[in-house]
């Protein structure tokens, strides 16, 4: 993500918002420049707390964070729908909350990856997230930004539903990716990525165990368990939606 934005006193813009903000981007637009935990209320949704990351590129909502293995991510559909974890630590915001933020708009999805040697990678995608009636399908609406190639995720235009061990929507007929790996994810063929996999502090010897880890195949490889991941989303302006 771009560097931190310059601070602006929110008091200057108080008159511009007479309700809770819809999302972190709207917060940014009315002058907020501090990152942190905020209460938002997307249209038609009850209020909830989100981590906002304010950058020179606007306000981003953090939808996932992993860094220490303190939270179990191997959870059923309802947990991934509602969200779980600690907003000050590791968490999954919740598919329904994310969808209430994005609505029918296209969004930018930023994925931050870190390995155990201190190397970091930032990927950005243009995506569209469907509602529960589509199993929260994630569709790439533009090519991947970065050097990792389109094999990291489904090709542009392909829509991949979200899967958990108890709700198998992956693109493999012969396998339940969430069950054979770990956690809930937009599984295509089980082998491209899984940022909600099991957290390993040390690399297990058995490959069978290793495949359950947190990985992004085209960065550090299929069997390299990542040290930290963060996912952030930013809805685009309504007119940018397809």
């Amino acid at each position: 993500l771009p560097e931190m934005a310059q601070p602006v006193d929110p008091a200057h813009n108080v008159s511009r918002l007479h309700r809770l903000p819809r999302d972190c981007q709207e917060l940014f637009q009315v002058g907020e420049r501090q990152s942190g935990l905020f209460e938002i209320q997307p249209q038609g949704s009850p209020p909830f707390l989100v981590n906002c990351k304010m950058t020179s590129d606007g306000g981003w909502t953090v939808i996932q964070r992993r860094h220490d293995g303190s939270v179990d991510f191997n959870r059923p559909w309802e947990a991934y729908k509602a969200g779980f974890g600690d907003p000050h630590g590791e968490f999954w915001l919740g598919l329904e909350k994310v969808h209430s933020i994005t609505g029918d708009r296209n969004s930018r999805l930023a994925v931050q990856l870190r390995d155990w040697d201190g190397n970091a990678e930032l990927l950005q995608f243009s995506v569209h997230l469907g509602g529960e009636d589509t199993a929260y399908s994630l569709q790439l609406t533009a090519p991947v930004a970065g050097q990792l190639g389109a094999t990291t995720v489904p090709p542009s235009g392909l829509s991949v539903p979200f899967s958990t061990w108890d709700q198998d929507h992956d693109l493999r007929r012969d396998k339940n990716c969430a069950k054979s790996l770990s956690g809930g994810w937009w599984f295509g063929t089980c082998s491209h990525s899984n940022l909600n996999g099991q957290y390993f502090r040390s690399i297990p010897q058995q490959r069978q165990k290793l495949k359950k880890g947190i990985f992004w195949k085209t960065w550090r490889g299929r069997y390299y368990p990542l040290q930290a991941t963060t996912m952030l989303i930013q809805p685009m302006a309504a007119e940018a939606a397809s």
Epitope: A11, V14, G36, E39
Partner: nanobody, 124 residues
Amino acid sequence: EVQLVESGGGLVQAGGSLRLSCAASVLTFGTYTVGWFRQAPGKEREFVSIITGSGTYNDYADSVKGRFTVSRDNAKNTVYLQMNSLKSEDTAVYYCAARHWGMFSRSENDYNYWGQGTQVTVSS
């Protein structure tokens, strides 16, 4: 400019109760997170409790958890701090503070507006 006025402080015996109020002069009060802080003589100001603009989320310092309850009535532009089972170590000046747009923070540096404070004294 948002004005905050605390009331409800006073002298109470240990084990007793008090209800503090924080009244705000702002039309869009439901968009403000409100925090309660306190400062005992010779000590630094410390976080007590917080409530979001909608009243949906709150949080407490470990030292008051289970004894204090924060609530709000946005129609009356007021936040309340119900303090039960008071102890002598609760003696302090209690301040309410507000932060626009619902930032959920325990840090006093994150609040734009402050009241003048109300004294709470608990005698043992």
